[in-house]
């Protein structure tokens, strides 16, 4: 399911409960995706010892995964709501190709991988409604994404395992940073 249970606007099972605000819905959606990532990481960590490796040991990779930096305005120091929101949406859009790569990379958690992908699409929609400055958001080029996907899928097994681990870890860190920032807005 792309949305946490009870989040569908058609859900009237609890009429006494106040409908979630836009911020609460985004917060819950991120936590739902993080739970999904946690389940996927369990499977990858059971298969290899990469999860125990330090970040430095895994730093040498040619993946250009989105990462929060001071200039993005999402940290406590230098916080800027609008700049940060643009970064979060842009980063999530950039992660989409990597989430596509994750499909078919899991045996027992195939549905979970799909749920993470679909939930991220929903999250992007929620955030786009919140953003005022949509013009500043750059969408990745589909042709570039397609060739990147082909390149990633052509790697040997060990590199594919490494790539899967790095994507999950980076996506988790990006979402955690995003959640911390959104809770300050």
């Amino acid at each position: 399911a792309p949305v946490p249970p009870g989040e569908d606007s058609k859900d009237v099972a609890a009429p006494h409960r106040q409908p979630l605000t836009s911020s609460e819905r985004i917060d819950k959606q991120i936590r739902y995706i993080l739970d999904g990532i946690s389940a996927l990481r369990k499977e990858t960590c059971n298969k290899s010892n990469m999860c125990e490796s330090s970040k430095e040991a895994l730093a040498e990779n040619n993946l250009n995964l989105p990462k929060m930096a001071e200039k993005d305005g999402c940290f406590q120091s230098g916080f800027n709501e609008e700049t940060c929101l643009v970064k979060i949406i842009t980063g999530l859009l950039e992660f989409e190709v990597y989430l596509e790569y994750l499909q078919n990379r899991f045996e027992s958690s195939e549905e979970q991988a799909r749920a993470v992908q679909m939930s991220t699409k929903v999250l992007i929609q929620f955030l786009q409604k919140k953003a005022k400055n949509l013009d500043a958001i750059t969408t990745p080029d589909p042709t570039t994404n397609a060739s990147l996907l082909t390149k990633l899928q052509a790697q040997n097994q060990w590199l594919q395992d490494m790539t899967t681990h790095l994507i999950l870890r980076s996506f988790k860190e990006f979402l955690q940073s995003s959640l911390r920032a959104l809770r300050q807005m």
């Epitope: 991120i30 946690s38 330090s54 970040k55 430095e56 930096a69 940290f75 406590q76 979402l175 300050q184």
Partner: antibody, heavy 118, light 109 residues
Framework: CQSLEESGGRLVTPGTPLTLTCTAS????????VTWVRQAPGKGLEWIGI?????ETAYATSAIGRFTISKTSTTVDLKMTSLTAADTATYFC??????????????WGQGTLVTVSS | IQMTQSPSSLSASVGDRVTITCQAS??????LSWYQQKPGKAPKLLIY???TLASGVPSRFSGSGSGTDFTLTISSLQPDDFATYYC????????????FGGGTKVEIK
Amino acid sequence: CQSLEESGGRLVTPGTPLTLTCTASGFSLSNYYVTWVRQAPGKGLEWIGIIYGSDETAYATSAIGRFTISKTSTTVDLKMTSLTAADTATYFCARDDSSDWDAKFNLWGQGTLVTVSS
Amino acid sequence: IQMTQSPSSLSASVGDRVTITCQASQSINNELSWYQQKPGKAPKLLIYRASTLASGVPSRFSGSGSGTDFTLTISSLQPDDFATYYCQQGYSLRNIDNAFGGGTKVEIK
């Protein structure tokens, strides 16, 4: 066995800068969030700040501008400036396993005592 | 976000049921932890996510609550449980004075 150890605590005069170091044994700090907490004699726990990745930090309102947290793969430093007698406390570092979104501190050092007195 | 703990101290006997409460100034979902601290020692994580027992913690400890109101319960107080207990919100560590509550000292009656 995994553990944390704080060092650098000592007697200093007011205004003297001081750096405390948190050192990990049995694991790499790069995979975890690290927080600093202090406790004045006979008082409760006071949260100071946290370092997430290599460059994202958050600080308590009272610590902003005076305290700075930085990180390497094996250590986390707490740099303190403009110290006063009110900063006299035992300083603890603690680890957050960073697996979830909420902050919780599941491994603590034994603390290092900082005394600020003229 | 401010955390208010009560009572600040209480006296109880071995075998008693003890309840400590913690209130957040705004909703923190279930993102609350409880710690136990003994004199001269570092705090120890007891409960996280309001109700999940940390590894190795006896089942006589339990936590409940969500939103702004939380409770730590010791079902049958043991000699080893006389200590100070702290709640800590993990919802947001930005622009806060303290993540911890003021503490509750559990003393022998």
